[in-house]
Amino acid sequence: LEVQVPEDPVVALVGTDATLCCSFSPEPGFSLAQLNLIWQLTDTKQLVHSFAEGQDQGSAYANRTALFPDLLAQGNASLRLQRVRVADEGSFTCFVSIRDFGSAAVSLQVAAPYSKPSMTLEPNKDLRPGDTVTITCSSYRGYPEAEVFWQDGQGVPLTGNVTTSQMANEQGLFDVHSVLRVVLGANGTYSCLVRNPVLQQDAHGSVTITGQPMTFP
């Protein structure tokens, strides 16, 4: 029995619903009474959802899963996972048995976009060329961990004197704080780019220092 799942991970945004696709080819005369369908977490073996002997056995996963009962007889064993959380990320095994059996694992990749970065400057007044300033770029509630890039007004990457920290909150979402220490020129723009590697989403923030006053676009 061939069980088919997508090769690529299913990407789902936190808080949305995701469908983990799984299908099999039923034989002629197939009856749901003969079907055993089990969704389990691949690594821990935790039961997620099951269908046995013609009956949906229900969700064993925080009551956030559902099958597509009207489609089972056509070989659609997909699982709907509601209100996706960071903790749901991982591999799910779809196992089907009728006369024969088969299984396949599908990966769920959870993602959340990062907020537009806020920029802070320290010190933030009486700045002169040659002063060393600390520019902090903060972006919130993204997943997975971000990639952070700094550049100057000419697009030249700034890699030295950058310290980036990422801390997960209770939901597993990351807050990113990246600090650039730079010696001021006569004027200049400093940009920070926070990239979500899964969504390929970039969030930009910049600060322009033009003597007095500074602007934060």
Epitope: L1, E2, V3, Q34, N36, I38, Q40, T42, K45, L47, S50, A52, E53, Q57, G58, A60, T93, F95, S97, I98, R99, D100, F101, G102, S103, A104
Partner: antibody, heavy 120, light 110 residues
Framework: EVQLLESGGGLVQPGGSLRLSCAAS????????MTWVRQAPGKGLEWVAD????????LYADAVKGRFTISRDNSKNIVYLQMNSLRGEDTAVYYC?????????????WGQGTTVTVSS | QSVLTQPPSASGTPGQRVTISCSGV????????VHWYQQLPGTAPKLLIY???ERPSGVPDRFSGSTSGTSASLAISGLQSEDEADYYC???????????FGGGTKLTVL
Amino acid sequence: EVQLLESGGGLVQPGGSLRLSCAASGFTFSSYPMTWVRQAPGKGLEWVADINSGGGTTLYADAVKGRFTISRDNSKNIVYLQMNSLRGEDTAVYYCAKHLDYYSYGMDVWGQGTTVTVSS
Amino acid sequence: QSVLTQPPSASGTPGQRVTISCSGVTSKIGSKYVHWYQQLPGTAPKLLIYRNFERPSGVPDRFSGSTSGTSASLAISGLQSEDEADYYCATWEGALNGWVFGGGTKLTVL
């Protein structure tokens, strides 16, 4: 007559390897999942591994996962159990079994078993 | 993973009815079916009951199976000396747990 005949058992040192074979006859071998079950001396039955009809999906008991490999050759009507990194606790009689028409209905035909002894 | 619990031993006299229990059949992971195997001394196991109560061809109707709640039972009526054997219950526990057997019950015909 439906028959299963195991072979390949014997005495092997800890850490060694052994390959068991189970030759099937009397039924359409390529249509049925197959199972290996073992029984340690004086103990009960313990499931070891399953393989589906085409050989594309395999299942293993935690105790043997990563050490044992179940495979089949549908052209020869044989199912194999490759056992590596053998331990004392693998000492048992190993049975192969054929499933009923529906996989979850159990195993209806069993071989006579082959004895594996792991000892130094 | 569930554990199927059987009494280690049971006994009866010829002609009697004996029952062997198998508890712990609570899983929603796989099939809810319980199967029973008979293993005569020195021989391979033989399927006695499948899908809780069905008998394969060739198995006498003296053997019957039933389920109730989280327990399954094998009943043997009109006990005969050739019924002296080990009896195992089994169920299927899903893709990642496989087949689970009870510890076995040794039936002695007195």
